[in-house]
Structure formats: C-alpha cells, structure tokens
C-alpha cells in the first residue's frame, strides 16, 4: 500500500508568492510559493495518485502583514481552501495568546489540529477541550493512517501560551498516544510536529511505533541530488534514522515560507511496516502556474492590507534617526527604539527568580534603512516602518556565550569609519570602544543587564556565561560578517516579523521619544572625548 505525504512547515504567512529569498515578490516572473501556486501542485498530485495526505507541521502564524491584519483567519480560510488533512501546532500559533489561536484557527479549521504534548489545565481545559487533539486517525482510501502531533517544549519562552497550558517532553507525551493508536489497530503512524530537526530525529529513534516523522521549526532543507535553488541541504531527503528497535524511519522537513512542497512516497506492507520511502521537496517556482480561483481570493483579501498599511500606529515626538550616517557610526535613537521593541516583545515572566528571561538586544546598523521624520504630524504607519525594515526578517532568540558576544562587538568596529553595516546598535548592553587600539582589541568595557535580579542593573560580561540575546535572523545566520554568532550559537529559535515587533510596540506606547543615552561610547584613548 502506497501513501504520498505532501507537507509544509514554517510557512509564516507567505500567502502570496515571494521572491527567491522569501521576501516580497518584485518580479512576478521569478517569484515562488504562495498558496495559489501550492494549490496547483497539490491538485495535480491528488489527481495523479490515489492515497495523498497534505500535512502542515506548524508555524503558519506570523511573518507578514497578512498575519498582522487577519490574525490567523487567513490561515484557516486558505488552509481550508487547500484542504489540508492535518496540522500540528507550532510555537508561533500562540503569538496572540490562546484566544488568538482558538477563535480564528481552532474553531474555523475544517481539519484536525494536533499536539500530544500540550496539556490544558484550569479553566482553559474545558474551553479548549476537543478543539485540538493529541492524535487523529485519518481515512485514506480503504486504509487508515494515524497522525500524532507535537510542539516545541520551548514555546513558553518563544510565544504567549499563557499559564494554563503545560508543554511536556515530546517523547514522553508521544509514546502513550502511539500505543493507544496501536490498540485501535492503526498500524501506519506519522509523527507530525514542530520541535526542530534534532528532536525529529530523536522521536524517530525513541518513540516505538512511529513510522515516519514530518517536522518543522528548524527550517531544515533536505534534498537528494542537485538542489534546485539557493538552499543548501542539511542531509538527504528523506533523512533515515535507525530506531532503537532497529527500524529505518524516514524523517522529513521542507525548509520554510512555502517555497517548497515536501513530497514523500512511502510503501507499507500489510502489517504497516515501511518497505521503502523516497521523494524530494518540490520547488514551487514560476513554472507552476498560480491557481486562478485561489489567486482571485487572495486578491480579494489583499485589499484590506493595502488599506491597513497607511493607517496611523502611533506618534513620535522626536526625529527617528535611522540614517546610515548615524546608525553605522554611533548609537542612534532608531536603533534604540527597535532594540527596546525587541525586548518588549520578548517579555515572558516564567520564573519568579528572573524579571525576564532575556534583557539583551543587538542589531546591525546596516539593517536600519531609513529615518522617520516627526514633522509629519508625528504619524508613524506600517508603510513608514516598512521603509526602515524592508527585508522581511525576524527578530530571533539565541543563546550564546559571553566570549562570542565579545567577538561580535569586536567585529562591530573592526573596520570602523567606513560606513559598513556591521556596527551594532544595542539594548540592555553598555559598550565602550577605544578606536585607537588595533582591530580585534577595541572593546574596553562591556556591561550587560542582569536578568536574575529584581532590580535590573548592569554587570560586566562574563566570558563563560551563557546569555540569551534577541537579534535579527540576518545576524543569527552570520550576516554582515558575524560568522562567530552562526558558528558558536548554542540555540536559535526563530521569532516574530521585524516590522510587526516595532509596530506593536509603537501601538502599545502610543507616543514615543527614544533618545541617544550612552549605550554605546567610543573614544580615541589618548584624548578621552566621546563621539555622539
């Protein structure tokens, strides 16, 4: 019996087609992805093959203005239109709290939404009961297939699930649900979830009875043969894990942003054992036409977005200096504003000992692309922010050692004065540079804001301590020469859309007045004056 698994993950509100790097589509003849194009390919496969499942491994939420405006209603609507068979909850599905998951998505999806390791307690238990499930048995042709869901245990640190959801260890939670499926005589079982490739492989190894793992969260690109675009494969597709009980378990993931459609063919014997598995992600490029009816629907939904982007979010009473003459040379108040928004977006009081789990932000000055003039009645719109942050990136959470941070700050000024983008803007950090010293030895003071304290204050950076830092995904991936971050980070979780973070902060504050306040100081040691 042959099963075709089509799968997506980490689509992050790319409902419309995008450019090759998953940012806004500029030249339509070279654009990729989007739900209209995805539908064309899915329907083509459904017509050609008998037993097809379309699965999503989480993080449909968050990533473009689509999510900002429609708040998940767009996800339910278009996933229903594409007739997804099941979805696992990702961490970003909780970005607007539990209500922001229940109302737009859980109540409106016409397909099951799954997670076995999220347990509701207190008053939420009865409210959310039955709206998501630990597993689902799906009829496929004359057979049935079991799907068990899982979600990153880190979700309370990455999103806003509130206090009434408990995120359990994935393997511990999955095993009894798989066992339950076995007692129902369901002998073909797929684990579908959102905890990253390392956990996907562990699930394949440790959870008895799981035949296939379809994952997400780590945006892992797997491919067999010559890859069709810019993504470099982390391994073959499918990635084969030998389980502790000696079975070969295929593990797959399909990069992110709807750029590819994962395509895995599995052959089962009559006892539900996997005999063979093969496939590859399909690049959804312009050779695949966009489905006209879905495209028309997208265009209809688009109208509200254009309207939204010109509405006032809040006001500034000061000039927001996002000029390269400032942000690539010294502390600039646009950099301070963005970093403050980044920290504010990551307030999660999950432990009495800590006022917050993260206090530090770094931001490459080259990523700030425009100032905002306060003399336009002080008005700030989404459109204004899109000029400041035009790359459609995310503000991510990383963990790294103090020694890595020190290297990053040395890199920040290693060729100071040439208007290069690596000069870092900061939050929760006080740095002093001596630019008369040789490159690689210019950081003379680096103090960081404590987290395990009731009154936040600045302490010297400790080289061996592990710190959490919020930064653009561009930096986490080693951009602007920050190779040391990419190479040495201990953990990296993708965060919220950059513009969305700043717009939410401005809406919350209503009126903003960020200052240049001595977070970054630089001197040429022999004459001790500061540049501001």
């Amino acid at each position: 019996w042959e099963l075709t698994i089509l799968h997506t993950n980490d689509v992050h509100s790319r409902l419309e087609q995008t450019s090759e790097d998953s940012s806004k589509c500029v030249n339509a003849s070279r654009c990729m992805g989007g739900v209209a194009r995805l539908f064309t390919k899915v329907q083509q496969i459904r017509r050609a093959e008998p037993n097809v499942l379309l699965l999503d491994a989480g993080d449909q939420y968050q990533g473009t203005i689509w999510f900002t405006v429609y708040k998940g209603a767009e996800v339910a609507h278009f996933m229903n239109a594409l007739r997804y068979d099941a979805m696992a909850l990702g961490n970003h599905e909780f970005d607007n709290g539990v209500e922001g998951l229940i109302e737009p998505l859980l109540k409106e999806a016409k397909f099951p939404i799954l997670s076995a390791n999220i347990k509701a307690k207190g008053p939420l238990a009865s409210q959310i009961s039955g709206l998501y499930l630990p597993y689902k048995v799906l009829p496929v042709g004359d057979e049935v297939v079991g799907i068990v869901g899982y979600t990153s245990k880190e979700t309370p640190f990455l999103s806003n699930p509130g206090t009434n959801l408990v995120f359990e260890d994935e393997i511990t939670a999955l095993q009894p649900e798989v066992d339950k499926l076995k007692t129902l005589n369901v002998n073909k079982i797929i684990a579908l979830g959102h905890s990253g490739f390392e956990m996907d492989k562990l699930i394949a190894q440790k959870v008895r009875g799981v035949d296939v793992v379809v994952g997400g969260h780590s945006n892992t690109f797997l491919y067999t043969g010559n890859p069709p675009s810019k993504e470099v494969p982390a391994g073959k597709y499918p990635f084969i894990v030998t389980s502790d009980d000696g079975r070969k378990v295929p593990v797959v993931q399909a990069y992110a942003f709807g750029k590819y459609l994962g395509y895995l063919k599995i052959e089962f014997d009559e006892r539900g054992n996997v005999i063979s598995s093969h496939g590859n992600p399909i690049l959804l490029n312009s050779s695949i036409p966009e489905d006209p009816s879905i495209k028309a629907d997208i265009n209809k939904w688009r109208i509200k977005l254009d309207n939204y982007s010109t509405q006032e979010l809040g006001k500034t009473i000061v000039y927001l200096d996002g000029s390269s003459q400032s942000c690539r040379f010294r502390e600039c108040n646009m950099g301070n504003l963005i970093c403050d928004a980044m920290i504010n977006n990551n307030l999660r009081h999950t432990d009495e000992m800590f006022w917050n789990h993260v206090s530090m932000c770094i931001l490459n000055g080259g990523g700030i692309r425009s100032p905002i003039d306060e003399r336009n009645n002080g008005t700030i719109t989404w459109e204004n922010l899109a000029a400041v942050l035009p790359f459609g990136g995310t503000f991510d959470l990383v963990q790294l050692k103090g020694s890595t941070l020190k290297k990053a700050f040395e890199h920040s000024v290693h060729r100071y004065g040439q208007s290069t983008g690596e000069f870092l803007q900061v939050g929760g950090i006080h740095v002093v540079y001596d630019l008369s010293r040789k490159p690689g030895d210019r950081v003379v003071k680096l103090d960081v804001l404590c987290t395990k304290c009731r009154v936040p204050s600045y302490d010297p950076l400790k080289m061996d301590e592990v710190y959490k830092v919020i930064l653009p995904n561009f930096l986490a991936n080693g951009g602007d020469g920050f190779q040391m971050i990419k190479d040495e980070l201990l953990r990296h979780d993708s965060g919220d859309q950059d513009i969305n973070v700043v717009s939410t902060y401005i809406s919350k504050m209503k009126v903003i007045y960020p200052a240049v306040e001595g977070r970054i100081k630089a001197h040429h040691h022999h004459h001790h004056h500061h540049h501001h």
């Epitope: 007739r83 068979d85 109540k107 409106e108 999806a109 016409k110 397909f111 099951p112 039955g130 499930l133 689902k136 048995v137 799906l138 009829p139 496929v140 049935v144 129902l184 005589n185 369901v186």
Partner: nanobody, 124 residues
Amino acid sequence: ALQLVESGGGLVQPGGSLRLSCEVSGFTLDYYNIGWFRQAPGKEREGVSCSSGSGGSTYYADSVKGRFTISRDNAKNTVYLQMNSLKPEDTGVYYCAAYRGWHPSLDARVYDYWGQGTEVTVSS
C-alpha cells in the same frame, strides 16, 4: 466543550419506523462529518450511516441501504437518522459521533467525539 446528545430511541414493532436525533453543541456542525453507529448486545460496534460536513455526501452500510436515511439541519445543529422498515436485527444502542476532516467514513476509529447513545428495540 463539544457534546453530542442522541434522542428518539424506543420500542417499535418490526416494519415500523423511528427517527433518531443527534443534537450537537460546542462546535459548528458543518465543519464535521457525523456518523451513526450501533451496537447490538454482545456484538461489535458497527457503522450505519455517515454524512459529510456540508451534507453533500452520505454513506450507508449495506444492511440498512434503502431503509435508513441520514440528514442534517446545520442551522439547528442537529443530525437525524430516519429508520424505516425496521427489523429485529436493527436492535441495539445507537450512537452518533463526529470528526473534522474532508472524507466521511464508517470506520469508528476516525471519530473523535461520541454521544452516550439511545436504545432502539425492534420486537413484536
């Protein structure tokens, strides 16, 4: 929470008719496939009939084809099973059940939500 409550069962003579109702609460009925199942004393639970979310597709077990009709009133959040030409072998507890998905099925394993059941006895 999602709930299904069956009613309309009772004692009926062979050849007679009954109309079972299943009232659902806590969810939008048209997003769910609804099935009727029955369990005779000492026997396995068996699928009788099911209806897709829109009501567009219906399926029947061979043993009841032509005698039973499933219908739904999504506005009233209720699903009905009209049973005509009843036979003694139709006796049992009748359950309604629901699940979200695109493909209606008579396989009990695919159903996630179940009612408590209503008893039907066909006897002279």
